[in-house]
């Protein structure tokens, strides 16, 4: 039931996970672990936040987004084939059995030896690894795959060009989003 994300050896992998804090700065503890989410915890923890800050991390694992706004997406730097597998994002919402847990599958492919293609106007060609599975699986919201060769400006431009399409909606709404409060 997990959503699959892809990256190539040597690239940075991106595993999305989001929630909406009840109020600015009113953060929820989050943990990321290697392995599927166990019943209470996060598996082999690689990064953890508390109500204020990132309080534990290991090398190559970091939060690139603004976690104070609920973007707790994990970036894994310079991936190798050994980074393949299931990762757990657990949003530890206070209260009785309120935790939200997401299992994300990371597939690492060998690095391509051909030069990276230039950005094309054909959306499918430009996004060969994009997953458009929102709403089609057991997770409440499924998300887009890693797009390591394309920057955010290019994504925004393409989204504008295709704002009326289903793909653009998926792109805009991507992320496992939890609303708190």
């Amino acid at each position: 039931s997990e959503v699959e994300y892809r990256a190539e050896v040597g690239q940075n992998a991106y595993l999305p996970c989001f929630y909406t804090p009840a109020a600015p700065g009113n953060l929820v503890p989050v943990c990321w672990g290697k392995g599927a989410c166990p019943v209470f915890e996060c598996g082999n923890v690689v990064l953890r936040t508390d109500e204020r800050d990132v309080n534990y991390w290991t090398s190559r694992y970091w939060l690139n987004g603004d976690f104070r706004k609920g973007d707790v997406s994990l970036t894994i730097e310079n991936v190798t084939l050994a980074d393949s597998g299931i990762y757990c994002c657990r949003i530890q919402i206070p209260g009785i059995m309120n935790d939200e847990k997401f299992n994300l599958k990371l597939v690492i492919k060998p690095a391509k030896v051909t030069p990276a293609p230039t950005l094309q106007r054909d959306f499918t060609a430009a996004f060969p690894r994009m997953l458009t599975t929102r709403g089609h699986g057991p997770a409440e919201t499924q998300t887009l795959g890693s797009l390591p060769d394309i920057n955010l400006t290019q994504i925004s431009t393409l989204a504008n060009e295709l704002r009326d399409s289903r793909l653009a909606n998926d792109l805009r709404d991507s992320g496992a989003t939890i609303r708190i409060g």
Epitope: V28, G35, P38, F40, E41, Q92, N98
Partner: antibody
């Protein structure tokens, strides 16, 4: 050395309340899920509450709404507040540490404290 | 809830003999290739002690005569050659779902 020491047990009347404590030492308490497990006299084991490292709470239906679990990481302490106690809550209550990274099974246990609910 | 049924309720074994204890779950406890089943030993007046986790992993400090096996819904704890200190009650426990549940126990007694 990991140690878990329960206290607060005793005799209480039906409908009454009791608060159990568990003092933890020998490990980084804040990183672990913790649970309470009970054992009625001559009976088997029953899990009654858990709290994750992040503070999320878990209960079986048998105690939901009557029991609450809490932790004080600064004091390395775990608590079980038991309200509206019934005769069937009579048991030895164990504090148990969930295995790191999982929490769903227990690698260290306290010696237990006896709670007797009787009029 | 996942119901765990242990059998037999009582097992009479002579020291040095092999003991085989069974635990059956009302639904699968497989999760991403791992069987989320544990075994504990409890002696009178003592707290339980973790023996086996994830169906077949022997906890540190537990003698090698203890082993676990099984997957899905059927699990087995085997004590290859019973020692006097092994006479106790054994419980299985699942960590697949809340509520966490234990089996009713198997008492291993001296024959």
């Amino acid at each position: 050395e990991v140690q878990l020491v329960e206290s607060g047990g005793g005799l209480v009347q039906p409908g009454g309340s009791l608060r159990l404590s568990c003092a933890a030492s020998g490990f980084t308490f804040s990183r672990y899920a913790m649970s309470w497990v009970r054992q009625a006299p001559g009976k088997g084991l029953e899990w009654v509450a858990a709290i994750s490292s992040g503070g999320s709470l878990y209960f079986p239906d048998s105690v939901k709404g009557r029991f609450t679990i809490s932790r004080d990481n600064a004091k390395n302490s775990l608590y079980l507040q038991m309200n509206s106690l019934r005769a069937e809550d009579t048991a030895v209550y164990y504090c148990a540490r969930g295995r790191e990274a999982d929490g769903g099974y227990f690698d260290y246990w306290g010696q237990g404290t006896l709670v007797t609910v009787s009029s | 809830d996942i119901v765990l049924t242990q059998s037999p309720a009582t097992l009479s074994v002579s020291p040095g003999e092999r003991a085989t204890l069974s635990c059956r779950a009302s639904e699968s406890v497989e999760y991403y290739g791992t069987s989320l089943m544990q075994w504990y030993q409890q002696k009178p007046g003592q707290a339980p002690r973790l023996l086996i986790y994830a169906a077949s992993n022997v906890e540190s400090g537990v003698p090698a005569r203890f082993s676990g096996s099984g997957s899905g819904t059927d699990f087995t704890l085997t004590i290859s050659s019973l020692q006097s200190e092994d006479f106790a009650v054994y419980y299985c426990q699942q960590s697949m779902k809340v509520p966490l549940t234990f089996g009713g126990g198997t008492k291993v007694e001296i024959k």
